[in-house]
């Protein structure tokens, strides 16, 4: 399957909250690389 940017962002935010509460870690943000249009993409989610 493929990965949706929405799902990644939601999961990341969950981990960020957990890191702060359980380990006293602060994650500021992640860098999302600029991507070209996926002309080779296939059908399906």
């Amino acid at each position: 399957g493929t990965i949706n940017v929405h799902d990644v962002e939601t999961q990341f935010n969950q981990y960020k909250t957990e890191a702060a509460s359980r380990y006293n870690l602060t994650i500021s943000d992640v860098s999302v690389s600029d991507v070209p249009f996926p002309f080779s993409a296939q059908s399906g989610a």
């Epitope: 940017v5 996926p38 002309f39 993409a41």
Partner: antibody, heavy 122, light 106 residues
């Protein structure tokens, strides 16, 4: 709530220029590609341009290449379309759209603005 | 350029009827997207990547196809489904749209 709001449409003479803007809100602008799509008076949809989230990758159909320039200002959450050497066939409603694609998937133009009207006529 | 053809410009269906809209491409594409447009509004993404329903789209809609032939099916037509439906290919540049099928309710 995702919002896209276009502006800048006008009546312009053939050969003239116009710059359209699209201000967005409700999502992290820099993480999404954006496109311009126009709808002609005959209701046909025509793709005009696409730009990647960081602005590195830009695509145009031959019909506008060399005349139109798509750009974005991620600090201002704004997409632009600079149009020059306008022709009567450029007359249309211009919509900006959010593009939900990534390195190996394309989930389509998932949000559209209401559009701004461009009329090219002498 | 890949030309997308929606051969039926206008079609009508009775409430509860099954409806199939078709879309064909001049050469093989990996997937297509479908958009719905009601009068006076902007197009809305309706089905993406051939068979995936966009957010809020009723489950009576489905999409299928491969290669050069694709379709959108409504299992039971409802009044709110009356609209114009456009298909689009983005397998190769330039991205192209079909001319649309206007679906009316009888």
């Amino acid at each position: 709530e995702v919002k896209l709001e276009e502006s800048g449409g006008d009546l312009v003479k053939p050969g003239g220029s116009l710059k359209l803007s699209c201000v967005v809100s409700g999502f992290t602008f820099s993480r999404y590609g954006m496109s311009w799509v126009r709808q002609t008076p005959g209701k046909r949809l025509e793709w005009v341009a696409t730009i990647s989230g960081g602005g590195t990758y830009i695509y145009y159909p031959d019909s506008v290449k060399g005349r139109f320039t798509i750009s974005r200002d991620n600090a201002k959450n704004t997409l632009y379309l600079q149009m020059s050497s306008l022709k009567s066939e450029d007359t249309a409603m211009y919509h900006c759209t959010r593009d939900n694609y990534g390195r190996n998937y394309d989930y389509g133009m998932d949000y559209w603005g209401q559009g701004t009207s461009v009329t090219v006529s002498s | 350029d890949i030309v997308i053809t929606q051969t039926t410009a206008i079609m009508s269906a009775s409430p509860g009827e099954e409806v199939t809209l078709t879309c064909s491409a001049t050469s093989s594409v990996s997937y297509i997207h479908w958009f719905q447009q009601r009068p006076g509004t902007s197009p809305k993404l309706w089905i993406y990547s051939t068979s995936n329903l966009a957010s809020g789209v009723p489950v009576r809609f489905s999409g299928s196809g491969y290669g050069t032939s694709y379709s959108l099916t409504i299992s039971r037509m409802e009044a709110e489904d009356a609209a114009t439906y456009y298909c689009q290919q983005r397998s190769s540049s330039p991205f192209t749209f079909g001319s649309g099928t206007k679906l009316e309710i009888k």
